[in-house]
């Protein structure tokens, strides 16, 4: 039960006080008691419940006509059952007794009022009055947790605007309101109550730039909403009529959780006594609601795809046809960024990551725009953000970044359990160097901080700086599976490739050619690849790098070897000993449900079939997956990327609600 104020009574004159329903009010009967008195009794109106406890240990007893010793160990508390119809209509009489004196009476006139700030603390999508049931001042995780949720209003419901909805202090329409959380102030007071009392709604100064609150005029259009709290206004005096009244507020978050903001926002209503104009206003009562800002959540390859993104560039028509066919098979919407908008930047995966935010009443896809800012710089903000599609970005927008700040270097695992700890939304994966040096690269700290601060997908740092481009999607992917954990981790594997090529050579296919059918590309015989000592050394190094990540992933995702599939792949070390794929990197695939768009490796053709394609199909088809090999050689591969790098996917949000987990 909420804490009320302390009321001191005195026999000299009647005391007048306000008691808010649902609060426990302490009654100080000792400090002004007549000197010779040693005991007391209490009588109260039917609407008042008096509790007397004599402790320690506390022996609680509701009052009758008993007398109690007048000593500091006695605690008297009041609660009120109903709101008053008029000021002071509930009475409490304290009688003091002494051995030699007649009883002395002290009178207390109480006004019972109902004041409660309600939000969806039960996370049902509806605001229900919760007076005296739950403590709204705490926010707890888990299925039995409580606490309201706010969305960052980061979409753009007004198509004529270039800004996010939370960047203005207007409510556009009912669509805009739906992105906000409802909070209701319910009051029931005597008619004249607010001639001597005031209600003020307020937020801590440290949080005022993270939230905006609009007051709605009931029964009127949403355009009647006016801002009452926000970056410029930490408090607002409310004009409340006496009697029974409800006031609606709509609350939007302005910032995602981050290193300097844990994501909690407390809104407080304070009841002030303004009856004495000579004195400052006195706080009679406070009620608070704590909101947590919904985190940005990534979706893994195991989530059903809803929309595919790719770029149109010079001569990639065949690539786009293949992606279109795949999207149609997977029943996905397809969005193509035209040449004039992408400015010859085809790396859709690197520019953005599409996740979502969720409150009980609303789920919103949100694009996380990377700070790489190349030709696709404007695409997320101009073409992806829109009505019910939010936007967020982090990191420096001009310089100071590395290739590891592109979002080919940002992936998320499917849900996992690691040594008994559940990650029902998976874990974020990004690449890093294995130790800092003058020329090592790492994801910008602002990006790392943001990802960690979301709390619900605890990040795992992998080692990717050994690659020339340096992205985790160059050596790993996840595909859905019908058994075990519901997925398999795919890892690029030079060992597996050498084994395959050795088997083919042993069967007399040493003359078979890699890169057959590719114009202007020197073809390589299996036997030459196998006998090239330098290439072997390079791939031995690469294998060690991937194996380091393999063990890291097994440990951090709780995987067994049987959860991992090795995809045959060779690499070569280029300048500054950084690795690149030797042939199109098959692990860099587009996963659309059971339909996989895999870079066509142009491996040695044996008995009419590419042995690399055949091997990959034999590994993945038993899982119910369909492999489509896409020719990306000249349009993507030779430019240091593949199918995954050149595409992006919006996926269905998890059915699991983030607030039901315990981070």
């Amino acid at each position: 039960m909420a804490q009320g104020t302390l009321i001191r009574v005195t026999p000299e004159q009647p005391t007048h006080a306000v008691c808010v329903l649902g609060t426990l009010t302490q009654l100080d009967i000792c400090s002004s008691a007549p000197e010779d008195c040693t005991s007391f009794s209490i009588n109260a109106s039917p609407g008042v419940v008096v509790d007397i406890a004599h402790g320690p240990p506390a022996k609680k007893k509701s009052t009758g006509s008993s007398t109690w010793p007048l000593d500091p160990g006695v605690e008297v508390t009041l609660t009120m059952k109903v709101a008053s119809g008029s000021t002071g209509d509930q009475k409490v009489q304290i009688s003091y007794y002494g051995p030699k004196t007649p009883p002395v009476k002290a009178l207390l006139y109480l006004t019972g009022v109902e004041i409660s700030l309600c939000a969806d603390i039960t996370r049902t999508g509806k605001v229900k009055p919760t007076r005296a049931v739950k403590d709204q001042r705490t926010w707890t995780w888990g299925p039995c947790g409580q606490g309201a949720i706010l969305l960052v209003n980061c979409d753009r419901d007004n198509l004529e605007s270039s800004a996010m909805d939370c960047e203005d202090d207007e409510v556009l329409d009912s669509e805009d309101l739906q992105d906000m959380s409802l909070m209701t102030l319910s009051t029931k007071t005597p008619k004249d109550f607010f001639t001597n009392h005031t209600l003020v709604l307020h937020v801590a100064r440290s949080e005022m730039d993270k939230v905006r609150v609009f007051q709605a005029t009931r029964g009127k259009l949403s355009s009647k909403c006016s801002v009452v709290l926000g970056p410029k206004w930490p408090s607002h005096y409310l004009m409340v009529p006496g009697g029974k009244h409800n006031m609606d507020f709509y609350v939007e978050a302005l910032a995602f959780p981050d290193t300097d903001f844990p994501g909690l926002i407390t809104l407080t209503i304070s009841l002030l006594d303004t009856s004495n104009l000579e004195l400052p206003e006195a706080v009679v009562f406070q009620d608070s609601v704590v909101f947590r800002v919904a985190p940005w959540i990534m979706t893994p390859n195991t989530q059903p795809p809803q929309e595919v993104y790719a770029c149109s560039i010079f001569e990639n028509e065949d690539f786009l046809k293949s992606v279109t066919t795949l999207a149609m098979k997977a029943k996905c919407k397809l969005t193509i960024c035209p040449e004039e908008e992408n400015m010859d930047d085809q790396w859709m995966q690197d520019e953005m990551e599409i996740g979502y935010i969720q409150a009980p009443h609303k789920t919103l896809p949100v694009v996380f725009d990377s700070p790489r800012n190349r030709g696709l710089k404007e695409f997320p903000i101009k073409r992806v953000m829109g009505p019910d599609f939010g936007y967020v970005t982090r990191g420096p927008q001009t310089g100071g970044i590395s290739g590891l700040d592109s979002f080919g270097n940002l992936e998320v695992s499917p849900p996992v359990t690691v040594r008994g700890k559940e990650y029902p939304l998976g874990r974020i994966l990004f690449g890093d160097s294995c130790y800092p040096s003058n020329d090592s690269r790492q994801m910008h700290q602002a990006l790392q901080d943001f990802l960690s601060a979301q709390q619900v997908q605890a990040p795992v740092k992998l080692y990717s700086d050994w690659l020339s481009v340096g992205h985790v999607d160059e050596f790993l992917s996840f595909v859905p599976a019908p058994d075990r954990k519901g997925f398999r981790l795919l890892l690029a594997s030079p060992r597996s490739c050498y084994k395959l090529f050795q088997e083919q050579q042993n069967e007399g296919h040493g003359e078979a050619l890699l890169f057959e059918g590719i114009k202007k590309k020197k073809q390589q015989k299996i036997k030459n690849i196998l006998s090239n000592k330098t290439l072997r050394e390079h791939n031995s190094f690469v294998e060690r790098c991937i194996d380091w990540n393999r063990e890291l992933l097994k440990r951090e995702l709780g995987l067994a070897e049987s959860d991992i599939i090795d995809i045959p792949q060779l690499f070569k070390l280029k300048e500054f000993s950084k690795a690149e794929a030797f042939f199109p990197n098959m692990v860099n695939m587009l996963v659309l449900g059971k339909h996989l768009g895999i870079p066509k490796p142009f491996g040695p053709v044996i008995n009419g079939r590419c042995c690399l394609e055949e091997k990959v199909c034999s590994l993945l088809e038993p899982l119910g997956l369909q492999c489509t090999f896409i020719n990306d050689f000249f349009t993507y591969h030779i430019r240091h990327g593949e199918v995954h790098c050149g595409t992006n996917v919006r996926r269905k949000p998890f059915s699991f609600k983030w607030w039901n987990m315990v981070p």
Epitope: S437, D439, S468, K522, N532, E575, H640
Partner: antibody, heavy 128, light 111 residues
Framework: QVQLVESGGGLVKPGGSLRLSCAAS????????VSWIRQAPGKGLEWVSF????????YYADSVRGRFTISRDNAKNTVYLQMNSLRAEDTAVYYC?????????????????????WGRGTLVTVSS | QSALTQPRSVSGSPGQSVTISCTGT?????????VSWYQQHPGKAPKLIIY???ERPSGVPDRFSGSKSGNTASLTISGLQAEDEADYYC???????????FGGGTKLTVL
């Protein structure tokens, strides 16, 4: 074959900044490794910085790390060298140079370590 | 003080051969086959004449040849001609935190 032209040099006070540009013609820079090399008056060559224009992989000499930033704009076919906190010892002719990354050998590293195309250079003078 | 050591100058008569040495360490010349040589005429930009120790770009006469032994690389110019008079610089990839090193340069005089 790509041709390179440097610009942006000039006189600057110590502590000042300059941005050098290296514009390419005749071929697309995204197929090339690009380095900046400088030569102080009457002195030898000193390697300054490198960028793999396909994916912004960068490296710097110890003498300029933290003060100079190499970047590129493939759409403009240009590589830049942003030079901050300039010192008198940075006075030199700055050359832009490149090596083609289109190599067909099974393994052919090393292209980024040598420069087969050079610009004519641009003079940077740091003096008060 | 350059990272790779070259003689300040060498000379030879037309038709003769000269060799310019370039001495590094086990962390650069000794470790990598990424040694290159550049020719620079006064007031001009350098020109690549040898890369990967001994390979010649197209258009460079076969009078220019490169080799390496241990931590020392060498450039040999046979059949010296007047137009060979120039400064010559060696360069190598290095394990150090500056990944490309140059020699201090050698002035070749054709007598």
């Amino acid at each position: 074959q790509v041709q390179l032209v440097e610009s942006g040099g000039g006189l600057v006070k110590p502590g000042g900044s300059l941005r050098l540009s290296c514009a390419a013609s005749g071929s697309t820079l995204s197929d090339y490794f690009v380095s900046w090399i400088r030569q102080a008056p009457g002195k030898g060559l000193e390697w300054v910085s490198f960028i793999n224009t396909a994916n912004t992989f960068t490296y710097y000499a110890d003498s300029v790390r933290g003060r100079f930033t190499i970047s590129r704009d493939n759409a403009k076919n240009t590589v830049y060298l942003q030079m901050n906190s300039l010192r008198a010892e940075d006075t030199a002719v700055y050359y832009c140079s490149s090596a083609n990354d289109d190599v067909d050998d099974i393994v052919a590293p090393g292209r980024g370590y040598y420069m087969d195309v050079w610009g004519r250079g641009t003079l940077v003078t740091v003096s008060s | 003080q350059s990272a790779l050591t070259q003689p300040r100058s060498v000379s030879g008569s037309p038709g003769q051969s000269v060799t310019i040495s370039c001495t590094g360490t086990r962390g650069d010349v000794g470790r990598y086959n990424h040694v290159s040589w550049y020719q620079q005429h006064p007031g001009k930009a350098p020109k690549l004449i040898i890369y990967n120790v001994y390979e010649r770009p197209s258009g460079v006469p076969d009078r220019f040849s490169g080799s390496k032994s241990g931590n020392t690389a060498s450039l040999t110019i046979s059949g010296l001609q007047a137009e060979d008079e120039a400064d010559y610089y060696c360069s190598s990839h290095s394990r150090s935190s500056t990944p490309v090193l140059f020699g201090g340069g050698t002035k070749l005089t054709v007598l």
